[in-house]
């Protein structure tokens, strides 16, 4: 699998999970969450040739057209599979609230 | 939705469905296939840019990410969404089988 | 140019619900609060609640006993507020107004036209 | 909740002359060195608008002429130089608790 586990500890160039670090303030202009300041979300980077991680029959046809016409825009794309949650913890007025964020972190990617 | 109804009627430049037709032996190199010679596959094609069909939480974060950072490699890519099934016909020696290829034809796309 | 231009004046039954859109534009929708507020007649402004568009986190005032829906769609830039079991006390200019963006409670600093709602019978 | 009581309720200024509004909480909106007090403007037949954010900011493309102070408990929003123009309702608003709440205008 494209995973964290996988793809941090190698040098894979074809499409893998990359290392992508947020900061709520500075890159998402989001002041008012308290905690985290911001999370490792990760993202998926890198071609997705023939035979590598294809996600559908949709998907291996078009690596396979692509292989016949290495000139086409139309080539699948390296995109996240797994994603986890991020609880974060903010204010409400006084109040601290805490939410959990559905679909926040990259864990794996596959070619769609 | 960028489906094809709303795709293949306008001069949309960003995420939207295109218009591919593939050639199975041409195209695949799958000569065996009897019916029908190709199909109408389409593919995804066109920039992400912020609240552009985005699919999950995670690509709005990656999307507005990318207005504070422009230079940033991590960016929403333009994927299949909704997937149709084909129809095939072949022969295993005299006698022809049909079979439903799912996930074949591409009818609308997401910022993923 | 920041803007919030809210949907058009509402006549309702008692009992009944209205629903008031506030179309935003010239900002990034997902980076700020949206609040509702409202105002009766010769009185003055009552917080309702606030939406925060990027994933639809919702903080109410109690005091709407949860009469109140608040939603946003993302892709269109708009905010929605749902008012239910509508009675005569309900008949007020309901207002979207955007929250300032250091915290989640702020001060407001762009508001929509407004949207006069009727309750009558 | 945190009740905001305004004085006078109404207010009649001449031209040039200075407006004080008084805003008083039922306690105090400090929190982390900021007084959460912010104060709007609502003209006849308008939404309101910010004026003054965390007690004594003036909000970007204000006239100078407005000014707050104050912490705590007690606020003042100040008018110098009075114009016709500056008619309305003045409002304050806290966000230091939970709901947030306004004042009751001051004409």
């Known amino acids: 699998a494209l995973d964290t586990n996988y793809c941090f500890s190698s040098t894979e160039k074809n499409c893998c999970v990359r290392q992508l670090y947020i900061d709520f303030r500075k890159d998402l202009g989001w002041k008012w969450i308290h905690e985290p300041k911001g999370y490792h979300a990760n993202f998926c980077l890198g071609p997705c040739p023939y035979i590598w991680s294809l996600d559908t029959q949709y998907s291996k046809v078009l690596a396979l057209y692509n292989q016949h016409n290495p000139g086409a825009s139309a080539a699948p794309c390296c995109v996240p599979q797994a994603l986890e949650p991020l609880p974060i913890v903010y204010y409400v007025g006084r109040k601290p609230k805490v939410e959990q964020l559905s679909n926040m972190i990259v864990r794996s990617c596959k070619c769609s | 939705a960028l489906d094809t109804n709303y795709c293949f009627s306008s001069t949309e430049k960003n995420c939207c469905v295109r218009q591919l037709y593939i050639d199975f032996r041409k195209d695949l190199g799958w000569k065996w296939i009897h019916e029908p010679k190709g199909y109408h596959a389409n593919f995804c094609l066109g920039p992400c840019p912020y609240i552009w069909s985005l699919d999950t939480q995670y690509s709005k974060v990656l999307a507005l990410y990318n207005q504070h950072n422009p230079g940033a490699s991590a960016a929403p890519c333009c994927v299949p969404q909704a997937l149709e099934p084909l129809p095939i016909v072949y022969y295993v020696g005299r006698k022809p089988k049909v079979e439903q290829l799912s996930n074949m034809i591409v009818r609308s796309c997401k910022c993923s | 140019e920041v803007q919030l231009v809210q949907s058009g004046a509402e006549v309702k039954k008692p009992g009944a619900s209205v629903k008031v859109s506030c179309k935003t534009s010239g900002y990034i929708f997902m980076k700020y609060w949206m609040n509702w507020v409202r105002q009766a007649p010769g009185a003055g402004l009552d917080w309702m609640g606030q939406?925060?568009?990027?994933?639809?986190?919702?903080n109410y005032n109690e005091m709407f006993e949860g009469r109140v829906t608040l939603t946003a769609d993302t892709s269109t830039s708009t905010a929605y507020m749902e008012l239910s079991s509508l009675r005569a006390g309900d008949i007020a200019v309901y207002y979207c107004?955007?929250?300032?963006?250091?915290?989640?409670?702020?001060?407001?600093?762009?508001w929509g036209q407004g949207t006069l709602v009727t309750v009558s019978s | 909740d945190i009740v905001m009581t305004q004085t006078p309720p109404s207010l009649s200024v001449s031209p040039r002359e200075t407006a004080s509004i008084s805003c008083r909480a039922s306690e105090s909106v400090d929190s982390y060195g900021n007084s959460f007090m912010h104060w709007y403007l609502q003209k006849p037949g308008q939404s309101p608008q910010l004026l003054i954010y965390l007690a004594s900011n003036l909000e970007s493309g204000v006239s100078d002429r407005f000014s707050g102070s104050g912490s705590g408990t007690d606020f003042t929003l100040r008018i110098s130089r009075v114009e016709a123009n500056d008619t309305g309702v003045y409002y304050c608003q806290q966000n230091d608790e939970d709901p947030l709440s306004f004042g009751q205008g001051t004409k």
């Open positions: 107004a955007r929250g300032y963006g250091n915290y989640a409670l702020d001060a407001m600093d762009y």
């Open positions: 939406i925060f568009p990027a994933w639809g986190s919702t």
